[in-house]
């Protein structure tokens, strides 16, 4: 392994998964590396093999149990190490004492559906996936709507500062195709970040009623 610029980032999905990304400029693509997890108050140790996702980036998932099981709490600390093989030995390339609830990234919201659509508005609902009951209602959402002729990056962000798993989109254009995405973030955690965006939900507003002849 080459001593290039390195970065090791991990997030807990709040239930039973720690996802990690390791990047290192100048590292050889065939370098064999793994993430080792050593909790302070659990009887398990876990290892996952880092697999390449780009030229100088590797990723892996520490799967701690069934997807909806609560495997870690706010008092847990898990020491995470990146170990890379150098000849016959393993070398520590990165290390952190990982506090799961300071480093949260939830799964993308799922089950997006159109509840009701009209000519100028659309009511959409969704569900959160594999989110800890510890959060109670301490979640926020961001949503965006893709209009014809625009990109996702141009779409204005709508912020929902509470656990609200629905939205009523207004001032839409009749008989027009749109797409909608939403993401979620817990309020807790210094290094917590937004979930990935949900799969886009496509919908079409209803056409305007034809005016009467005069």
């Amino acid at each position: 392994a080459v001593n290039g610029t390195s970065q090791f980032t991990c997030f807990y999905n709040s239930r039973a998964n720690i996802s990690c990304v390791w990047s290192q400029d100048g590292a050889l693509q065939d370098t064999s590396c793994q993430v080792h997890a050593w909790p302070d108050r659990r009887r398990w140790n876990q290892t996952c093999e880092l697999l390449p996702v780009s030229q100088a980036s590797w990723a892996c998932n520490l799967i701690l149990g069934a997807p909806d099981s609560q495997k870690l709490t706010t008092v847990d600390i898990v020491t995470l190490r990146v170990l890379c093989r150098e000849g016959v030995r393993w070398r520590v390339m990165a290390i952190q004492d990982f506090k799961p609830f300071e480093n949260l990234r939830l799964m993308a919201p799922i089950s997006l559906q159109v509840v009701h659509v009209e000519t100028h508005r659309c009511n959409i609902s969704w569900e959160i996936s594999q989110a800890s009951h510890y959060f109670e209602r301490h979640l926020e959402f961001e949503a965006r709507t893709l209009s014809p002729g625009h990109t996702w990056e141009e779409a204005p962000l709508l912020t929902l500062k509470q656990k609200q798993e629905w939205i009523c989109l207004e001032t839409l254009t009749p008989d027009t195709q749109y797409e909608f995405q939403v993401r979620v973030k817990p309020l807790q955690g210094e290094f917590t970040t937004w979930s990935p965006w949900s799969q886009p939900l496509a919908f079409r507003t209803k056409p305007a009623a034809l005016g009467k002849d005069t």
Epitope: S6, I77, T79, M93, D97, K99, E190
Partner: nanobody
Framework: QVQLVESGGGLVQPGGSLRLSCAAS????????MTWVRQAPGKGLEWVSS????????HYADSVKGRFTISRDNAKNTLYLQVNSLKPEDTAVYYC???????????????????RGQGTQVTVSS
């Protein structure tokens, strides 16, 4: 704002010991990895030792291994460096520094710090 204040340095004879302290404020101390570096007169910064946020992982420069011990008391927001069997070549200003996240990289241990204290002078002389 982030503040790091070192203390505990002084003049000591070869073979002597000191305990350096670094009082941290302005951030959630146990969320961050910490490190000690030193600068000898006329020399560049030299990494000494690093420790993870909960103190479960430590690394040392070969020049101090077996003589220096890094530790932290997260309840007191304080980082320590116990320095034993001091040699004249340990004479330097000792600085504590915060890494910019909970992670540090033992192969490039000086990289990734974002705040450093003003330092405490350690002089080893008979």
């Amino acid at each position: 704002q982030v503040q790091l204040v070192e203390s505990g340095g002084g003049l000591v004879q070869p073979g002597g010991s000191l305990r350096l302290s670094c009082a941290a404020s302005g951030f959630t101390f146990d969320n961050y990895a910490m490190t000690w570096v030193r600068q000898a007169p006329g020399k560049g910064l030299e990494w000494v030792s690093s420790i993870t946020g909960a103190g479960r992982g430590t690394h040392y420069a070969d020049s101090v291994k077996g003589r220096f011990t890094i530790s932290r008391d997260n309840a007191k927001n304080t980082l320590y460096l116990q320095v034993n069997s001091l040699k004249p070549e340990d004479t330097a200003v000792y600085y504590c520094a915060r890494y910019s996240s909970s992670t540090y990289y033992p192969t490039t241990p000086v990289r990734g710090t974002d705040y450093r204290g003003q330092g405490t002078q350690v002089t080893v002389s008979s």
